[in-house]
Interface confidence: low
Amino acid sequence: SKLKDPELSLKGTQHIMQAGQTLHLQCRGEAAHKWSLPEMVSKESERLSITKSACGRNGKQFCSTLTLNTAQANHTGFYSCKYLAVPTSKKKETESAIYIFISDTGRPFVEMYSEIPEIIHMTEGRELVIPCRVTSPNITVTLKKFPLDTLIPDGKRIIWDSRKGFIISNATYKEIGLLTCEATVNGHLYKTNYLTHRQTNTIIDVQISTPRPVKLLRGHTLVLNCTATTPLNTRVQMTWSYPDEKNKRASVRRRIDQSNSHANIFYSVLTIDKMQNKDKGLYTCRVRSGPSFKSVNTSVHIYDKAFI
């Protein structure tokens, strides 16, 4: 017959206690069971003890009591009691869980990244969680994006969950960058930082500043500016091929313009001094980002003397 779910001494789905207090949690069940605990509550911790005993009528039930002395804010999380796999039960594991907030006025966030941001990898169009969960469900948290944006939870695309943080159901390029969760407790402002990182391979556009055939007098300097436009956080490699490449005639300078809030603009400027006849021909700027590839070329003609 199916086992009854194990029963926890604390009822409901969540419980709030103060940091420094002792957590007592008993699990009573019809079979042997195990505890699943938040990562920071390691089973070997000196402040944690689990005692097992027989209990109930005729001592036929299984009980275990979890005691966590001087509970800390970072012990906040799910505490669950689950049956070990029981052959007679069709369900592999039956469990009961409770989320325990360990409130600390000096530490509103369970994980604090105040100096160095934690990196979160994101994919556009997918769910993104900014995991600034809190030590008390009553704390009001604001999500900000550097430098000036505030991301407002609307209950649909952006949802606040005190156990998880901010859940963004359909992440866009707007969520790329430095995101900060802020909470004010007793007049003190607390911040925890996250750096969202997305790698894309899209190349929007590649241009050479003078795409028409370039006409140049011998001895003059050739300057070709290749511009690649990409979405934010896309990285590109830009290379040139040209007639006298084997002699490394050209010097190439590169720079990135990240001032645009929607795109990165990569510049590669090719310069050849004192152009000669052997420098005439096809100049190609190649742009690669992962599997994506685009190129653009222009022809360069050399003339001995000016003509009318």
Epitope: E115, I116, P117, I119, H121, L195, H197, Q199, N233, R235, V236, Q237, R254, S289, G290
Partner: antibody, heavy 125, light 108 residues
Framework: ELQLVESGGGLVQPGGSLRLSCAAS????????ASWVRQAPGKGLEWVSA????????YYAESVKGRFTIFRDNSKNTLYLQMNSLRAEDTAVYYC??????????????????WGQGTLVTVSS | SYELTQPLSVSVALRQAAKITCGGN??????AQWYQQKPGQAPVLVIY???RRPSGIPERFSGSKSGNTATLTISRAQAGDEADYYC???????????FGGGTKLTVL
């Protein structure tokens, strides 16, 4: 499976040259900066050189500046170290290493999370 | 040039806590990394950004930083933790990666 495999090591006379290669697989090589680190027999780790994801920025230890050149070919998923004017004190196992995620390289450096098994360079007459 | 100072060796009794320090006059403004290297093997990153553990590294390993000293703590040292440990920082002023001299950890 993520792998970094160094090659090109061997015995070379003082003043000679060697080119080390590091073939990367199992990840998008062009997303990450990379380094060369060496270890002389019985000694500690010594950083040699580093290069940004695109190859635009390169960095060198004072002991190798002007003699060694780091470069990469992202189309071949390969990192290189060209070593010229080699000296006896350059004798070491040379490791290539991939940087940890560095979306804004200049702001935060998080170390190297994957290393090759190393290639031995011996400089001796 | 920038230098990081580590003790040459540290001994610890089995299942006791081991602490390895790394000192540098400007370490407070850098992010410190720690590597474990066993004989004949490549180094393994055990702590990055002062106190963060890469996936797969046991919870016994933790890092901290106070003033000009970074510390690697192995809370319940095991025989398999015997290795050389190196601290590392990025020195922004010279644009160089710097390693400490290494510490040999012996588990008694």
């Amino acid at each position: 499976e993520l792998q970094l495999v160094e090659s090109g090591g061997g015995l070379v006379q003082p003043g000679g040259s060697l080119r080390l290669s590091c073939a990367a697989s199992g990840f998008t090589f062009s997303d990450y900066s990379a380094s060369w680190v060496r270890q002389a027999p019985g000694k500690g780790l010594e950083w040699v050189s580093a290069i940004s994801w695109s190859g635009d920025s390169t960095y060198y230890a004072e002991s190798v500046k002007g003699r060694f050149t780091i470069f990469r070919d992202n189309s071949k998923n390969t990192l290189y170290l060209q070593m010229n004017s080699l000296r006896a004190e350059d004798t070491a196992v040379y490791y290539c290493a991939k940087s940890w995620a560095t979306p804004i390289e200049s702001l935060y450096y998080y170390g190297s999370d994957y290393w090759g098994q190393g290639t031995l360079v011996t400089v001796s007459s | 040039s920038y230098e990081l100072t580590q003790p040459l060796s540290v001994s610890v009794a089995l299942r006791q806590a081991a602490k390895i320090t790394c000192g540098g006059n400007n370490i407070g403004s850098q992010t410190a990394q720690w590597y474990q290297q066993k004989p004949g093997q490549a180094p393994v990153l055990v702590i990055y950004a002062n106190n963060r553990r890469p996936s797969g590294i046991p919870e016994r390993f933790s890092g901290s930083k106070s003033g000009n000293t970074a510390t690697l703590t192995i809370s319940r040292a095991q025989a398999g933790d015997e290795a050389d440990y190196y601290c590392q920082v990025w020195d922004a002023s010279t644009q160089a990666i710097v390693f400490g001299g290494g510490t040999k950890l012996t588990v008694l």
